[in-house]
Structure formats: C-alpha cells, structure tokens
C-alpha cells in the first residue's frame, strides 16, 4: 500500500483539507470520491457540481482538495483511489464539529426566599458531539444533572441544578459554562440570584460614646435592620415593661434623656419584612453618677479609672426568629 490519507476534524462552516498522498508514484490515475462514492476529483478535474471543493494541489504524488463551508451532511468517509495494479483505495474520515447553537439558562423563580431550593436549567442546543455543561455559583463549582437528547446526529444537552439558596447568595451569579471541542475559550451564560431574606437586626449605642450609662446622662440607641426586601417596620419596645415617659422614638432611633435607675431593663428593636421578623435586645443598666473628690492642698495625685464594658451575645432560639443580641453593660 502506497496510498495514504489522514482523518480530518473540522468545525462546521470552516474549511476541511483532504489529501491523498502517493509514495513511489507511477503517475497512475487518482481520484477522490465522496461518502456516496461520487467522484469529486478525477486527477485534476472536478466533475462534481459542488463548487465548495477546490483543487489545492495535483501532482503524481498528491491530490489535495479543500472543502469550504463544511456542514454536518459532509461528514463521512472520503475515498482516495489509485489505479495501480492492483488498484488501491484508502479513506479519510471527515468529522464535523458543531458548536452549540444556543445557550439558555432558565431559573425556576425570579426571586427566591432564603432556605428555599430552586431549580436552574441550562440548555445547549444542537451541538456535535454533545456538550459538557459545568455549573458555578460565583467561583464555586456545583454539580448538575445532565440529560442528552439526540436528533439527526445533533445533541441537545439540558443540565439541571437544584440549588438551596442562602441570604449570602443574593446578587451572586449562577454560571452555566459549556465545554465543547468546537468552542475555544469560555462560552457561558449567567443569571444573578435574587434572594429574599428576613431582617438582620443590630443595635448600636451612638451615645454615650464610651459605652458607660450613668444616672442623669442621655442614651441614644440606633437600630440597624437589613433584609430583602428592606424592612418597612422598625419598632422599639421595652420588654416586660412600659417605655419610659421621657423616651423619644424617632424612626430607628431611641433617645432616653436624664437616665435614672427606673429605666433599667431590656429594650428591643423589632424589624419585619414579607419573609419574616427578627429582633435584637439591648440590656440597659444605669450606673451611679461619679463621686466628686475635692483636690488636695499640698500634693497632686493622678488616679486612672479603667472601665470595662462587656458585650454579651445571647442566641434566642425561638422558632422562626433570628438569634437576638442582648447587649449587657456591667
């Protein structure tokens, strides 16, 4: 055998080159046939009416032909025939790769609630061979479940991802990424998750700055509530007691002027949205006013007083509510 060919892999729409190579040629007739065994080239002449075939080289040692705008119907065995004695035949297989025509991502719900499991589907249509689909949530790879549907030598792959969403997932992209031999670089599509979650409540003492509350001083607490959708109701209540008469409520702020021991107790900020409600508690303890020491007449003494503020976080395990923060000043 002194007739040689090489298999060709080509992307749909691109150019395939078919080469029939002859070692030790005696100038015998050489021809190239298509998978239907129709003659494409007889020597340097193309009897076939398909003008996508063009002669690149014809000599006693080679018949080289290009096929432009390759389609999937061009796939198959192409035969080189050399009419020596005995005649020789060799075939080259053209494999046509078809990149996915379309990449579609579909999320079951536009908006999900934290803790909910949602279904995300990604479909890569009409590729050859079948596409591999990979899933990412942000930079984290996730595992999906793929189904392949074959139709007329083409493959449509649908990958299903079941995703339990958390509040941290809000605004994070879910990425469907395709791996296919006809695709160079990244072919991907993404959708951003929209996750609704109940408020997170945090109490901040904005006055006094040093954190020690004494009789006669003022107290200002600010309630920060973050949720999705943003909480519309932020309310202050005093646990197990009435709110002091001299307390002033202004939106998320609670002001108590001229603190006295009767103000001691737990102050709760409550916030809610359509997902649920949560609260945070602040435990107020009013200290005695500082005692005044008269200055000495002969010697000067510097006294340094160190005040320690302890913030204790207590988790409230009541069902359906966020763990509350109880800030206790000693």
């Amino acid at each position: 055998q002194n007739l040689f060919t090489k298999d060709v892999t080509v992307i749909e729409g691109e150019v395939a080159t078919i080469s029939c190579q002859v070692n030790k040629s005696d100038d015998s007739v050489i021809q190239l046939l298509n998978p239907n065994r129709q003659t494409i080239y007889f020597r340097d002449f193309r009897p076939l009416k398909d003008s996508r075939f063009q002669l690149l080289n014809f000599s006693s040692s080679e018949l080289k032909v290009s096929l432009t705008n390759v389609s999937i119907s061009d796939e198959g065995r192409y035969f080189c025939q050399l009419y020596t004695d005995p005649p020789q035949e060799s075939y080259t297989t053209i494999t046509v790769l078809v990149p996915p025509r379309n990449l579609m991502i579909d999320i079951q719900k536009d908006t999900a609630v934290e803790g909910e499991e949602i279904e995300v589907n990604c479909t890569a249509m009409a590729s050859k061979p079948a596409t591999t689909i990979r899933w990412f949530k942000g930079n984290t790879e996730l595992k999906g479940k793929s189904e392949v549907e074959e139709w007329s030598d083409m493959y449509t792959v649908t990958s299903q991802l079941m995703l339990k969403v958390h509040k941290e997932d809000d605004g994070v992209p879910v990425i469907c990424q395709v791996e296919h031999p006809a695709v160079t670089g990244n072919l991907q599509t993404q959708r951003y998750l929209e996750v609704q979650y109940k408020p997170q409540v945090h109490i901040q003492m904005t006055y006094p700055l040093q954190g020690l509350t004494r009789e006669g001083d003022a107290l200002e607490l600010t309630c920060e509530a973050i949720g999705k959708p943003q909480p519309v109701m932020v309310t202050w209540v005093r646990v197990d007691d009435e709110m002091p008469q001299h307390a002033v409520l202004s939106g998320p702020n609670l002001f108590i002027n001229n603190l006295n021991k009767t103000d001691n107790g737990t102050y709760r900020c409550e916030a809610s949205n359509i997902v649920g409600k949560a609260h945070s508690d602040y435990m107020l303890y009013v200290y005695d006013p500082p005692t005044t020491i008269p200055p000495p007449t002969t010697t000067t003494t510097t006294t340094t007083t160190t005040t320690t503020t302890i913030l204790t976080i207590i988790t409230d395990s009541r069902a359906g509510e966020e763990g509350s923060i109880r800030a206790v000043d000693h």
Epitope: S28, V29, F45, L48
Partner: antibody, heavy 115, light 108 residues
C-alpha cells in the same frame, strides 16, 4: 504531437469476434482511462467501456457479456474484443482518452458486419 | 435508450444565439461535457466541467448547468458551427459513461 492511432479488421461476418487496437503517442499513459466508443451509421455515440494502465475496467452494462478490453502498458496500447457480432454491431469504432471527459479521440474505424 | 436526453434538432439564424440542452438524473451531481461532430469526423470536445473550453475552441461556446439540465450556448452562431452536438456524463456511480442522443444544429 499527442495522438491516438487505431487499427483492426473492418469487415466481419456475424458471430465473429471484432478486434481493434489503439496506440497512444504521448506522455502519461498511466494517468488516464482509455475508452472505446462506437457510432452506428446515422446514429448517436455509444460508450463501450474503459480501461486504465493497471487493467481496471468498466463496461457498458448492455455490452458487458460480449466485451473484453485489455491493455499493454509496455507499448502504451489498449485493445477491444467484441464477441459474437451481428449486423447491429456495424459502426464506426473510436478509441478515446478519458479524463472523465474525452479530450483526445482516434480517427475511427468503420467495422461492418455482413454475411 | 439514452440516460441523457437531448432535442434531436435545433436551428439558429447566422449570428444569433442558440442553446442546446441535455437532461438527466446524473446531471444533478455531475457536470456534462459537450462534443461537436461534423460529418465523417471524430467528435471534438468543446466544453467540459463547469464552463471550461479546451484550447482552440472559440469563446462563443459556453456551458452552464442547473438542476438536472446542462446547456451549451453558442453566442453568435457561425456557419462552421453547423454540426451534431453530443452531451456526455457518467452515471451517478461514476463507473459508466453515458451520452445524450445528439442534437443536429442547423445554422440558417
């Protein structure tokens, strides 16, 4: 000059064997197919068959049972034998070079079959 | 019966354009070749492939193809173009040669 020269008996009796030879003068005998074509008087062209230098043949299915085409590469010659001739085989017989199309023809030999 | 079909006779006025056609299933895949034959002479190739003329053939001869029909067009026919014209191709397998029945062209 590239040419085809043909010769053979011009008068045959029915049931005899027609025998014609064609010689190619030029380069690349091995690079082509070599055909025989005939034309009955006042009628159209009819392809008989073809051969290449290695002896591979293709024949007209309607004549295949009676036809033999052979080749002698040492002389750049090919020959036609047609058995059991009848008056219907009376025709001008042409040899031709084939590159799929027939780009070179012999001058033709009139073969008459008559008792 | 031929696998390629031609009109038996066509006439054209001197200097006018004439088209000779050839029909057959194999022409869906393959180009036809065209031959001119004058009385007492061997055929001469005038057109082959998509529209190729051998050297020495005037450029008034041209070929075209559509579907299962091949055409030979003579633009500005001359008196010396009066002859029989044969189309030829191979069958779909490529193994057997077929000729049309021939068209007699008369130049008036």
């Amino acid at each position: 000059q590239v040419q085809l020269q043909q010769w053979g008996a011009g008068l045959l009796k029915p049931s005899e064997t027609l025998s014609l030879t064609c010689a190619f003068y030029g380069e690349s005998f091995s690079g082509y197919y070599w055909s025989w074509i005939r034309q009955p008087p006042g009628k159209g062209l009819e392809w008989i068959g073809e051969i290449n230098h290695s002896g591979s043949t293709n024949y007209n299915p309607s004549l295949k049972s009676r036809v033999t085409i052979s080749v002698d590469t040492s002389k750049n010659q090919f020959s036609l034998k047609l058995n059991s001739v009848t008056a219907a085989d009376t025709a001008v017989y042409y040899c031709a070079r084939s590159s799929w199309y027939f780009d070179l023809w012999g001058r033709g030999t009139l073969v008459t079959v008559s008792s | 019966s031929s696998e390629l079909t031609q009109d038996p006779a066509v006439s054209v006025a001197l200097g006018q354009t004439v088209r000779i056609t050839c029909q057959g299933d194999s022409l869906r895949s393959y180009y036809a070749s065209w031959y001119q034959q004058k009385p007492g002479q061997a055929p001469v190739l005038v057109i082959y492939g998509k529209n190729n003329r051998p050297s020495g053939i005037p450029d008034r001869f041209s070929g075209s193809s559509s579907g299962n029909t091949a055409s030979l067009t003579i633009t500005g026919a001359q008196a010396e173009d009066e002859a029989d014209y044969y189309c030829n191709s191979r069958d779909s397998s490529g193994n057997h040669v077929v000729f049309g029945g021939g068209t007699m062209l008369t130049v008036l």
